[in-house]
Interface confidence: low
């Protein structure tokens, strides 16, 4: 239904606290360099304006769209061109082109320092002095670094952050309480960021239909007792919600997400037997809980998939009369039977089934032609299963750090032109798949591994798209979203690459490495490893092990030395010479 004032409508639906949080996220995702203080001023102005519209929907400007109101606010910022260059050109455009222009200027890799967590005492002091401002800073810092973060979910993580601080800041050992809990929130939030970026990429590159297919498969796995019509309704709603968030319509997105949660809780009987615990929670937790819900039990009496999709004499007629519906039903029926498959795999199977019907239904004897289609799925299923098996075995053998290094070598060989920081980030994230997925029960491994890898590879594609340097990466990134992971897996050493010259300074280290946290130390070592591979793309595993082992010993020795600087200065050149020799 239409509202006189959209901003008043959203303010009333969301409530002041969530409204302000979402407006702050929106501004932080659009103007990623602005300081918190500048954004919070705009948020307050927008909130005050929304309140005047709630009091009187006919008040001046209350009938304007939210894009118009937000865009006008952003464009009124002084020195916009000085700070944002080209983005200021967007302000010359009218809506909806202006918003499109803002979206195109979102930077997936903004030049911002890594978010440093203050030490425990300082954190607790500022949290207790002003919790609202403290959590506002959290929203701002995360949103500006992740301009596609799913806004209602970010509000949920801020709530979690709040809970952790409320609990831990009363403890005697604040750091011991805070560190593991905040690490867990951070890890979940980072995974959520890459997953949502993948959804926005899917929407941007392949449109709503592709996202809806993803949603149908996912919902069918989770809710195998729901009817196809119900799954279609949920998938359609979820597509609309994600389109809004990816498009910067954060207030509408959060409002619609809450509506969907309400609908699901009011219709549990036709959706899933597992929803009740989620439905007892407050709105943000309810939506998050529903998004993470465990799969319902598969109905016991499901007939073979072959009955309707292979053996039925009307297959081609059904397909011809309503292609999308027939394929949607196939995806639904296959997915609800296979919670043990990744969504990417299910979509590849549906694509294979569609291609088979396209070919066979045009031939003289269609049933004879498509009769073997289910058997033809076998290699498509085996490929990711083998990937999971070999990678989880490697992870179990090497541990997370060693596994990351193995992936780093592999990916540097596949795409040596890609910048070292990007390769290190990708390998570290890809390597986390072991810790995240390989410890799960067998039936959950494949969906966990493949769907997580797909999201991380999407991040690699997004970064590469900004400055394309590798034809192979461009090829894998340009194809269909569901074929990306197999495409990257199939890449081999890039034979066209001319090895980098050996530069001694790349492998020269100083005593500052000794005081770095473990994570930063690892990144330094992995940076050196990637550079080694770029210098010697065909180095054997043993050669690399020797050099990296030597390097680790060198760092260890010099960090224990009485005169660290002297040790690094004298031992460093020896290490470089030995490394060159080992790789010759």
């Amino acid at each position: 239904e239409a509202h006189k004032s959209e901003i008043a409508h959203r303010f009333k639906d969301l409530g002041e606290q969530h409204f302000k949080g979402l407006v702050l996220i929106a501004f932080s995702q659009y103007l990623q360099k602005c300081p918190y203080e500048e954004h919070i001023k705009l948020v307050q102005e927008v909130t005050d304006f929304a309140k005047t519209c709630v009091a009187d929907e006919n008040a001046e400007n209350c009938d304007k769209s939210i894009h118009t109101l937000f865009g006008d606010k952003l464009c009124a910022i002084p020195k916009l061109r000085d700070n944002y260059g080209e983005l200021a050109d967007c302000c010359a455009k009218q809506e909806p082109e202006r918003n499109e222009c803002f979206l195109q200027h979102k930077d997936d890799n903004p030049n911002l320092p890594p978010f440093q967590r203050p030490e425990a005492e300082a954190m607790c002091t500022s949290f207790q002095e002003n919790p609202t401002s403290f959590l506002g800073h959290y929203l701002h810092e995360v949103a500006r670094r992740h301009p596609y973060f799913y806004a209602p979910e970010l509000l949920y993580y801020a709530e979690k952050y709040n809970e952790v601080l409320t609990q831990c800041c009363t403890e005697s050992d604040k750091a011991a309480c805070l560190t593991p809990k905040l690490d867990a929130v951070k890890e979940k939030a980072l995974v959520a960021a890459v997953r949502q970026r993948m959804k926005c990429s899917s929407m941007q590159r392949f449109g709503e239909r592709a996202f809806k297919a993803w949603a149908v498969a996912r919902m069918s796995q989770r809710f195998p007792n729901a009817e196809f019509a119900e799954i279609t309704k949920l998938a359609t709603d979820l597509t609309k919600i994600n389109k809004e968030c990816c498009h910067g319509d954060l207030l509408e997105c959060a409002d619609d997400r809450a509506e969907l949660a309400k609908y699901m809780c009011e219709n549990q009987a036709t959706i899933s037997s597992k929803l009740q615990a989620c439905c007892d929670k407050p709105v943000l937790q309810k939506s998050q809980c529903l998004a993470e819900i465990e799969h319902d039990n598969i109905p016991a009496d499901l007939p073979s998939i072959a009955a309707d999709f292979v053996e039925d004499k009307e297959v081609c007629k059904n397909y011809a009369e309503a292609k999308d519906v027939f394929l949607g039903t196939f995806l639904y029926e296959y997915s609800r039977r296979h919670p043990d498959y990744s969504v990417s795999l299910l979509l590849r199977l549906a694509k294979k089934y569609e291609a088979t019907l396209e070919k066979c239904c045009a031939e003289g004897d269609p049933p004879a032609c498509y009769g073997t289609v289910l058997a033809e799925f076998q290699p498509l299923v085996e490929e990711p299963k083998n990937l999971v098996k070999t990678n989880c075995e490697l992870y179990e053998k090497l541990g997370e750090y060693g596994f990351q290094n193995a992936i780093l070598v592999r990916y540097t060989q596949k795409a040596p032109q890609v910048s070292t920081p990007t390769l290190v980030e990708a390998a570290r994230n890809l390597g986390r798949v072991g810790t995240k997925c390989c410890t799960l029960p067998e039936a959950q491994r494949l969906p966990c591994v493949e769907d997580y890898l797909s999201a991380i590879l999407n991040r690699l594609c997004v970064l590469h798209e900004k400055t394309p340097v590798s034809e192979k990466v461009t090829k894998c990134c340009s194809g269909s979203l569901v074929e990306r992971r197999p495409c990257f897996s199939a890449l081999t050493v890039d034979e066209t690459y001319v090895p980098k010259e050996f530069k001694a300074e790349t492998f020269t280290f100083h005593s500052d490495i000794c005081t770095l946290p473990d994570k930063e130390k690892q990144i330094k070592k992995q940076t050196a490893l990637a550079e080694l591979v770029k210098h010697k793309p065909k180095a054997t595993e043993d050669q690399l092990k020797t050099v990296m082992g030597d390097f680790a010993q060198f760092v260890d020795k010099c960090c224990k030395a009485a005169d660290k600087d002297n040790c690094f200065a004298t031992e460093g050149p020896n290490l470089v010479a030995r490394s060159k020799e080992a790789l010759a």
Partner: nanobody, 123 residues
């Protein structure tokens, strides 16, 4: 052989009510979404309401929302259409239809059709 047999049509005054029934045979009723369509003289056939195979999901055309209610009894292989506050523009031949695969419920997705039952709203 699949058969859909409608009943319950007739003449009624504006503001009155009717209950249409559709009895199905020759198909696994609980595997089919069911719908009611109508065709007024000289007009295209239009979808009025439909209900998914378990009854958990329904669709109503805007023109009948709040006045018509669809329901089904899978144990009796029957679908019902309760029509209240009838108007002269509801006058039409009402068809019952069954769909094996139903998402949007447009006409071409329905596989089996009944012969229709006539509803006339007139004072």
């Amino acid at each position: 052989e699949v058969q859909l047999v409608e009943s319950g049509g007739g003449v009624v005054q504006p503001g009155g009510s009717l209950r249409l029934s559709c009895a199905a045979s020759g198909l696994t009723f609980s595997s089919y979404a069911m719908g009611w369509f109508r065709q007024a003289p000289g007009k295209e056939r239009e979808r009025v309401v439909s209900i998914s195979r378990g009854g958990g999901y329904t669709y109503y055309a805007d023109s009948v929302k709040g006045r018509f209610t669809i329901s089904r009894d899978n144990s009796e292989n029957t679908v019902y259409l309760q029509m209240n506050s009838l108007r002269p523009e509801d006058t039409a031949l009402y068809y019952c239809a069954a769909a094996r695969y139903w998402a949007t419920g447009s006409e071409y997705e329905f596989d089996y059709w009944g012969q229709g039952t006539l509803v006339t709203v007139s004072s």
